[in-house]
């Protein structure tokens, strides 16, 4: 009875297990008893990134810089293209077919993680002590300044989207305050 | 250094049943095809069984089919060979042998042999 | 399923000769052939896949040939140390046989 399964590098056909193609050839024709299986490098802009049986080799990923992309790593007879974004844009998928801006962080909210060609910036609200009042997506919050470092008393509270407003000390209360 | 050990053997009566074990170290057993070969006493090579390295993939001897059944688990890279309804002409030096596969540019196509073996287990079928 | 014929089933050789062990096939197998040395008591030992390639770190004494359905294995000048058994194994399909061996004896 003809065989039902083959090893994991060959394939069955014709009642026959044949050699698949390595990575980087397409199959031309199929094995027979006496001859090998035939295959045939894949052309320039094409790959096949498994051992295969295929007739065809697919297409390398085109990067179209209409679109923001531009060439991460060039693809191989074995490998294809990878494509990334332009700087200041990021990729909308895992496949990265097409980019958007990077996302700026409103004045209340800072940089928690600038975004690189694949992820958008990642923002957190300021906590209390800190401000940003700015819209960037670079910008992390900053801290409160601190008056008293400075010999100064705080004029004006900070709120997330403003700093504290420092002011000279009032003579003499601190006067008072000593005596 | 590439090893491969079995156990499991003895002696088991006619119809009986019995589990063959063969432990893999030295090399990631995960990515290897796998075998199981026979040796009755004083006779030749017989192939027993094969396993793909995923497990997905299994083929047997006519001889074994329906009786024998081979599995593996490459979390703790053992090869296992569940062998029921025993008979007499199954007693016989029992190796796991490893597939290779060897592929350079001298051989586009590749080749496969069994380049490592275990020492073998004994299984006496015998009332 | 594809059967293996070994010739002779057993040789008997001196030290220094060249000896030559063939294998012929039912159906065409192109070159997926391997041999194998066993000596008693231990287990087979890979010497050539492919039908031709010589599996590292065998002597160069061994060299195996053909495609198809005739193969042979020979050994150029034997040494104390090749006195064992050859079998032959086709690796083209399912299921995988072996021919029944050849003894190479001292003379």
């Known amino acids: 009875e003809p065989p039902t399964a083959c090893r994991e590098k060959q394939y069955l056909i014709n009642s026959q297990c044949c050699s698949l193609c390595q990575p980087g050839q397409k199959l031309v024709s199929d094995c027979t008893e006496f001859t090998e299986t035939e295959c045939l490098p894949c052309g320039e802009s094409e790959f096949l990134d498994t051992w295969n049986r295929e007739t065809h080799c697919h297409q390398h990923k085109y990067c179209d810089p209409n679109l923001g992309l531009r060439v991460q790593q060039k693809g191989t007879s074995e490998t294809d293209t990878i494509c990334t974004c332009e700087e200041g844009w990021h990729c909308t998928s895992e496949a990265c077919e097409s980019c958007v801006l990077h996302r700026s962080c409103s004045p209340g909210f800072g940089v928690k993680q600038i975004a690189t060609g694949v992820s958008d910036t990642i923002c957190e609200p300021c906590p209390v002590g800190f401000f940003s009042n700015v819209s960037s997506a670079f910008e992390k919050c900053h801290p409160w300044t601190s008056c008293e470092t400075k010999d100064l008393v705080v004029q004006q509270a900070g709120t997330n989207k403003t700093d504290v407003v420092c002011g000279p000390q009032d003579r003499l209360r601190h006067h008072h305050h000593h005596h | 250094e590439v090893q491969l050990l079995e156990s499991g053997g003895g002696l088991v009566r006619p119809g009986g049943s019995l589990r063959l074990s063969c432990a893999a170290s030295?090399?990631?057993?995960?990515?290897?095809?796998m075998n199981w070969v026979r040796q009755a006493p004083g006779k030749g090579l017989e192939w027993v069984s094969y396993?793909?390295?995923?497990?997905?993939?299994?083929d047997y001897a006519d001889s074994v089919k329906g009786r024998f059944t081979v599995s593996r688990d490459n979390s703790k890279n053992l090869l296992y060979l569940q062998m029921n309804s025993l008979r007499a002409e199954d007693t016989a030096v029992y190796y796991c042998?490893?597939?290779?596969?060897?592929?350079?540019?001298?051989?586009?196509?590749?080749?496969?042999?069994?380049?490592?073996w275990g020492q073998g287990t004994m299984v006496t079928v015998s009332s | 399923d594809i059967q293996l014929t070994q010739s002779p089933s057993s040789l008997t050789a001196s030290v220094g000769d060249r000896v030559t062990i063939t294998c012929r096939s039912s159906?065409?197998?192109?070159?997926?052939l391997a041999w194998y040395q066993q000596k008693p008591g231990k287990p087979p030992k890979l010497l050539i896949y492919?039908?031709?390639s010589l599996e590292g770190g065998v002597p160069s004494r061994f060299s195996g040939s053909g495609s198809g359905t005739d193969f042979t294995l020979t050994i150029s000048s034997l040494q104390p140390e090749d006195f064992a058994t050859y079998y032959c194994?086709?690796?083209?399909?399912?299921?995988?046989?072996f021919g029944q061996g050849t003894k190479l004896e001292i003379k």
């Open positions: 042998a490893r597939d290779v596969f060897f592929f350079d540019s001298s051989r586009p196509n590749g080749a496969y042999g069994m380049d490592v």
């Open positions: 030295g090399f990631t057993f995960g990515s290897y095809e």
């Open positions: 396993i793909s390295s995923s497990g997905e993939t299994t």
């Open positions: 159906q065409g197998i192109r070159s997926s």
């Open positions: 492919g039908a031709s």
């Open positions: 194994q086709q690796l083209n399909s399912f299921p995988s046989t």
